[in-house]
């Protein structure tokens, strides 16, 4: 039961995380105009990975896409790449993990196969989460660098007569969404990897031995005791069950109308 719960929870957490990564990647507010210690402007600027927007106090908002690839900063391209890789890996991970879920029956899939798929999806979620966190962190670092550079020469002008206010940008909502989403995907991936350990059949078998009570030929099968060897060199010991140890979670059930094929 614990394995199923861990796997299910890992899947749900990763699903939320990947949805968040997608949302963050699409959001326009990666960087927003810094309003602190600035003249009050009737125009608010904010930028995303794909376009920059201007919202006027009149309510009119205009967004312009970055219709160039070569003209964009390498760092922005790197952030885009990291986020896309994160989304792709996360999406594949989700697809793999759906088939790996214990609560879903697909033919006569072995537990070992499900364990491998769970591990694969877990690793994918971990890498996906790390990509998102890295992407957001790179962008945040870029913002911090630019912020202090623009603060250093915030007012530029001709002999101090005419002043040009330099627009400074600070962290936008998308960065926080990205960090949280990346973290959730990472946690989900770790949970999947933990669930994988519970799913995998152990190398050491659970031996069952028959005890002959006096006057009765009743076979007693100890359930929860691992016997790596029999009891001494009793040649009458019969091997009744020679499978991997299974908890109630792993007991095969027949497909019902609620199972997905």
């Amino acid at each position: 039961m614990a394995v199923t719960a861990c796997q299910g929870l890992g899947f749900v957490v990763s699903l939320i995380g990947i949805a968040g990564i997608i949302a963050a990647t699409c959001m326009d507010q990666w960087s927003t105009q810094d309003l602190y210690n600035n003249p009050v402007t009737a125009v608010f600027n904010y930028q995303g990975l794909w376009r920059s927007c201007v919202r006027e106090s009149s309510g009119f908002t205009e967004c312009r896409g970055y219709f160039t690839l070569l003209g964009l900063p390498a760092m922005l391209q790197a952030v885009r790449a990291l986020m896309i890789v994160g989304i792709v890996l996360g999406a594949i991970g989700l697809l793999v993990s759906i088939f790996a879920l214990k609560c879903i029956r697909i033919g006569s899939m072995e537990d070992s196969a499900k364990a491998n798929m769970t591990l694969t999806s877990g690793i994918m979620f971990i890498v996906s989460g790390l990509c998102a966190i890295a992407g957001v962190s790179v962008f945040a670092n870029m913002l911090v660098t630019n912020f202090w550079m623009s603060t250093a020469n915030m007012y530029t002008g001709m002999g101090g007569m005419v002043q040009t206010v330099q627009t400074r940008y600070t962290f936008g909502a998308a960065l926080f969404v990205g960090w949280v989403a990346g973290g959730l995907t990472l946690i989900g991936g770790v949970m999947m990897c933990i669930a994988c350990r519970g799913l995998a059949p152990e190398e050491t078998n659970y031996k069952a031995v028959s005890y002959h009570a006096s006057g009765h030929s009743v076979a007693y099968k100890p359930g929860g005791f691992k016997a790596s060897t029999g009891f001494g060199s009793n040649t009458k010991n019969k091997k009744i069950y020679d499978g991997g140890a299974r908890t109630e979670d792993e007991v095969q059930s027949y497909p019902s109308k609620h199972d997905y094929v």
Epitope: P39, V40, T41, A42, V54, E56, S57, S58, G59
Partner: antibody, heavy 118, light 113 residues
């Protein structure tokens, strides 16, 4: 057709109060930023106050800050300007305007006259 | 506050003449986000409320005759009437629409010569 109709102007003594109203029609009032602009007799235009749509941020000219309060009632399609501690220099025609692209004031009412005199 | 300086303060013009009105702001009105200048021009005829002519320094409002044009960037702006008409007799105002308070210029009065 866009229409802005101001009301509430009149003669008031210095230190007195007055509340101007502006009834808007012909456009989605709740989605628009609106402003008050005044013009003293024989003088130029002076922006007084603005209120944005949505969260309703308010902005004021330094000369009226702390004395005037701009507000809106989207349900009634109305804009208001509560004027307290009126001074002789507040005597002017007050125009209700709508803000448009570029924050430009594209529609203006006919104005309501406010006279502050003892 | 942003100071808007208009010149000349008044001008007598003959019909068909080209008119240029200058407006200077104490700070740049250029927004880096969209590369637009937040300067607006208005026309006010006697006894009437002002009328929007040009916004974003050079975008003509719909219904405004094409003899009116706006130009300039940053701090220096110009309103041009390519061929002055009798109905253009009015006071013209420029306005800073970038910084609060949204200050107006003192106005330029155009009279018929």
């Amino acid at each position: 057709e866009v229409q802005l109709v101001e009301s509430g102007g009149g003669l008031v003594k210095p230190g007195g109060s007055l509340r101007l109203s502006c009834a808007a029609s012909g456009f989605t009032f709740s989605n628009s930023a609106v402003s008050w602009v005044r013009q003293a007799p024989g003088k130029g235009l002076e922006w007084v106050s603005s209120i944005t749509s949505g969260v309703s941020y308010t902005y004021y000219a330094d000369s009226v800050k702390g004395r005037f309060t701009i507000s809106r009632d989207n349900a009634k399609n109305s804009l208001y300007l509560q004027m307290n501690s009126l001074r002789a220099e507040d005597t002017a025609v007050y125009y209700c305007t709508r803000q448009f692209k570029g924050n430009a004031l594209d529609y203006w009412g006919q104005g309501t006259s406010v006279t502050v005199s003892s | 506050d942003i100071v808007m300086t208009q010149s000349p303060s008044s001008l007598s013009v003959s019909p068909g003449e080209r008119v240029t009105i200058s407006c200077k702001s104490s700070q740049s009105l250029l927004n880096s986000g969209n590369q637009k200048n937040y300067l607006t021009w208005y026309q006010q005829k006697p006894g009437q409320p002002p009328k929007l002519l040009i916004y974003w320094a050079s975008t003509r409002e719909s219904g405004v005759p094409d003899r009116f044009s706006g130009s300039g960037s940053g701090t220096d702006f110009t309103l041009t009437i390519s061929s002055f008409q009798a109905e253009d007799v009015a006071v013209y105002y420029c306005q800073n629409d970038y910084f609060y308070p949204l200050t107006f210029g003192a106005g330029t009065k155009l009279e018929l010569k």
